[in-house]
């Protein structure tokens, strides 16, 4: 029961996390313009991974996508890649984990298969969460670096007909959404991995071993057993040791001089 609850909770937490990663990736508020020391306080600029937006105090908002792919900073491209990888891995993980849920029965799927699928999805969620956290952190680092560089260059002169305005960007809402979502996906993945351990079959297989007495066809079956654990459990009645002992599944052989009582 605890295993099912852990697995189910892990799935739900990961689902919320991945939804958050998708939301963060699509959001425009990755960086917001710090309006301190800005001449036009009525205009507010915020930028995302895919487009830039301008909002005015009047309520007017205009958003436009970035033109070039090659002209954009390498760091921004890296963040885009990390977020997309996180979403893809998370989506695959969700798909795998649906079939791995203990409460869902699909044909004659064994617990060992479900355990493997739970572990796989758990690892995928962990990597997905790490990708999201890494992506958001790289972007945040880029903002912090740019912020201090901008502060240093704040009072540059006119510089001819075109002057670069040292606008300072600060953390947008998407960064916090991304960090929380990545963390949730990571936690969900860990929970799935924990649930996997409980799903792994820890069977005690009682082997019925046939002993053949010389000249008799009576099979004596003692209560010998072998406990096995883990994925590699001896689920089929295989030969445990050589000698006169045969498993019940094996064909009865004729008595030989090597058989003993």
């Amino acid at each position: 029961m605890a295993v099912t609850a852990c697995q189910g909770l892990g799935f739900v937490v990961s689902l919320i996390g991945i939804a958050g990663i998708i939301a963060a990736t699509c959001m425009d508020q990755w960086s917001t313009q710090d309006l301190y020391n800005n001449p036009v306080t009525a205009v507010f600029n915020y930028q995302g991974l895919w487009r830039s937006c301008v909002r005015e105090s009047s309520g007017f908002t205009e958003c436009r996508g970035y033109f070039t792919l090659l002209g954009l900073p390498a760091m921004l491209q890296a963040v885009r890649a990390l977020m997309i990888v996180g979403i893809v891995l998370g989506a695959i993980g969700l798909l795998v984990s649906i079939f791995a849920l203990k409460c869902i029965r699909i044909g004659s799927m064994e617990d060992s298969a479900k355990a493997n699928m739970t572990l796989t999805s758990g690892i995928m969620f962990i990597v997905s969460g790490l990708c999201a956290i890494a992506g958001v952190s790289v972007f945040a680092n880029m903002l912090v670096t740019n912020f201090w560089m901008s502060t240093a260059n704040m009072y540059t002169g006119m510089g001819g007909m075109v002057q670069t305005v040292q606008t300072r960007y600060t953390f947008g809402a998407a960064l916090f959404v991304g960090w929380v979502a990545g963390g949730l996906t990571l936690i969900g993945g860990v929970m799935m991995c924990i649930a996997c351990r409980g799903l792994a079959p820890e069977e005690t297989n009682y082997k019925a071993v046939s002993y053949h007495a010389s000249g008799h066809s009576v099979a004596y079956k003692p209560g010998g057993f072998k406990a096995s654990t883990g994925f590699g459990s001896n689920t089929k009645n295989k030969k445990i040791y050589d000698g006169g002992a045969r498993t019940e599944d094996e064909v009865q052989s004729y008595p030989s001089k090597h058989d003993y009582v």
């Epitope: 600029n45 009047s58 007017f60 970035y66 670069t164």
Partner: nanobody, 120 residues
Framework: AVQLVDSGGGLVQAGGSLRLSCAAS????????MGWYRQAPGKQRELVAI???????DYADSVKGRFAISRDNTKNTVTLQMNSLKPDDTAVYFC??????????????WGQGTLVTVSS
């Protein structure tokens, strides 16, 4: 590259009117604000009037009620209608545009300037 071409300056009598025009060309994400600044001989450059993409305008106290700024976003032009001109308004008028050029790249683009002389 973004470029601004301003025009419409000249000599005018006190109390007269003049219309300044400015056209922007090039590629950008957002033309955040367009406006006019002026610089009188021996003085600092000062804001005259500014207008945002949404049409919100702001004026210097000295020109309020006399000057009117308007903008055509489709043609990327800004015009400054100057009425009841005074000799104090004599200056070189510069067109300005604040542009979001690309990802976290904001530019202040300036026109070459047009001289307005108001005679008493």
């Amino acid at each position: 590259a973004v470029q601004l071409v301003d025009s419409g300056g000249g000599l005018v009598q006190a109390g007269g009117s003049l219309r300044l025009s400015c056209a922007a060309s090039g590629i950008w994400l957002h033309m955040v604000t367009m406006g006019w600044y002026r610089q009188a001989p021996g003085k600092q450059r000062e804001l005259v009037a500014i207008i945002t993409s949404g049409g919100s305008a702001d004026y210097a106290d000295s020109v309020k009620g006399r000057f009117a700024i308007s903008r055509d976003n489709t043609k990327n032009t800004v015009t400054l209608q100057m009425n009841s001109l005074k000799p104090d308004d004599t200056a070189v008028y510069f067109c300005n545009a604040r542009v979001v050029a690309d990802f976290q790249k904001v530019l202040d683009v300036w026109g070459q300037g047009t001289l307005v002389t108001v005679s008493s």
